[in-house]
């Protein structure tokens, strides 16, 4: 099981995405969640959003499955600046996964950057124009 973080932009919207890769039989009791500014106590209860993994992917001819939690910010503001983390927890086995911290930095010019993702996922956004700069 592993967890990755990513981001994508659609117009003025910013999507923060937590992706968990797991085997079919590992899904039961697993919760994926996204926290903001929670360095030590990130939990489903303190999260911005949580997703309970499907106990059944719907088909049987699958090995590893990817499940995605998507948190959408319709318009990034200074309030969204901070440190984010994707996490996952199994209520069945007690396994806990913690993704890398990543940050949203809102600049005085009205733009924002997302840092701390994989190199190819280091994003800089022009907030006003809604484009990748």
């Amino acid at each position: 099981i592993n967890i990755t973080s990513s981001a994508s932009q659609e117009g003025t919207r910013l999507n923060l995405i937590c992706t968990v890769w797991h085997k079919k039989e590992e899904a039961e009791g697993f919760v994926v969640f996204l926290c903001k500014d929670r360095s030590g106590d990130c939990s489903p209860e303190t999260s911005l959003k949580q997703l309970r993994l499907k106990r059944d992917p719907g088909i049987d001819g699958v090995g590893e499955i990817s499940s995605q939690l998507m948190f959408t910010i319709s318009q990034v503001t200074p309030l969204h600046s901070g440190t984010y983390q994707c996490c996952a927890r199994s209520q069945k086995s007690g396994i806990r996964l913690q993704g890398h911290f990543f940050s949203i930095l809102f600049t005085e010019t009205g733009n924002y950057t997302v840092t701390g993702l994989k190199q190819r996922q280091h994003l800089e956004f022009s907030h006003n124009e809604g484009t990748l700069s």
Epitope: L51, R52, K54, R55, D56, G58, I59, D60, G61
Partner: antibody
Framework: QIQLQQSGAVLARPGASVKLSCKAS????????MQWVKQRPGQGLEWIGA????????RYTQKFKGKATLTADKSSSTAYIQLSNLVSEDSAVYYC?????????WGQGTTLTVSS | DIVLTQSPPTLSVTPRDSVSLSCRAS??????LHWYHQKSHESPRLLIK???QSISGIPSRFSGSGSGTDFTLSINSVETEDFGMYFC?????????FGGGTKLEIK
């Protein structure tokens, strides 16, 4: 005991839309895929699509994209199929079924008749 | 989409005969194949799951075998209540698909 109770027979005009229901009881509705299957008189079974009530994820066979819309209401443990722009070929029995590997529990079916 | 071909389309038998119904997949589906029986004006009923696994409440005269692309449903000593339509179904990949069916009728 597990039951899937479907809504009663429907007569609809061509071009209209209908919404059929399937109320589940006796199990945790949100953690099993609900399937919808079409059967025309004297014909075989045709898989329309499925919905996972826990998160609303739905899948369709290509033929029914744009024709069928699957939804689920967690509060009432009810799955729905909406069929739009009805034509005579939509006349059939529509079944809901729960997936546990195979489709282990089936509703009694709803007969839809499209006629002017 | 995976196509399931059932044969024969119709099978005429006498009660107490033993029969085999075939289902062939257009590509390998491992053991992700299920069998259903449907009587006229009734809902289908699951007989066998995952090619060979029995279902609680289904008589032991029903058995399934096969893997990959070729599957068989066997009925050991057919009873009158067994007549009707038999369908196979694959759950290996989206979209789920059904075979065209085999009609088991009284000779």
């Amino acid at each position: 005991q597990i039951q899937l109770q479907q809504s009663g027979a429907v007569l609809a005009r061509p071009g209209a839309s209908v919404k059929l229901s399937c109320k589940a009881s006796g199990y945790t509705f949100t953690t099993y895929w609900m399937q919808w299957v079409k059967q025309r008189p004297g014909q075989g079974l045709e898989w329309i699509g499925a919905i996972y009530p826990g998160d609303g994820d739905s899948r369709y066979t290509q033929k029914f994209k744009g024709k069928a819309t699957l939804t689920a209401d967690k509060s009432s443990s009810t799955a729905y199929i909406q069929l739009s722009n009805l034509v005579s070929e939509d006349s059939a029995v529509y079944y809901c079924a729960r997936r546990l590997g195979g489709f282990d529990y089936w509703g009694q079916g709803t007969t839809l008749t499209v006629s002017s | 989409d995976i196509v399931l071909t059932q044969s024969p389309p119709t099978l005429s038998v006498t009660p107490r005969d033993s029969v085999s119904l075939s289902c062939r997949a257009s590509q390998s589906i491992s053991n992700n194949l299920h069998w259903y029986h449907q009587k006229s004006h009734e809902s289908p009923r699951l007989l066998i799951k995952y090619a060979s696994q029995s279902i609680s409440g289904i008589p032991s005269r029903f058995s399934g075998s096969g893997s990959g692309t070729d599957f068989t449903l066997s009925i050991n000593s057919v009873e009158t209540e067994d007549f009707g339509m038999y369908f196979c179904h694959q759950s290996n990949s989206w979209p789920h698909t059904f075979g065209g069916g085999t009609k088991l009728e009284i000779k």
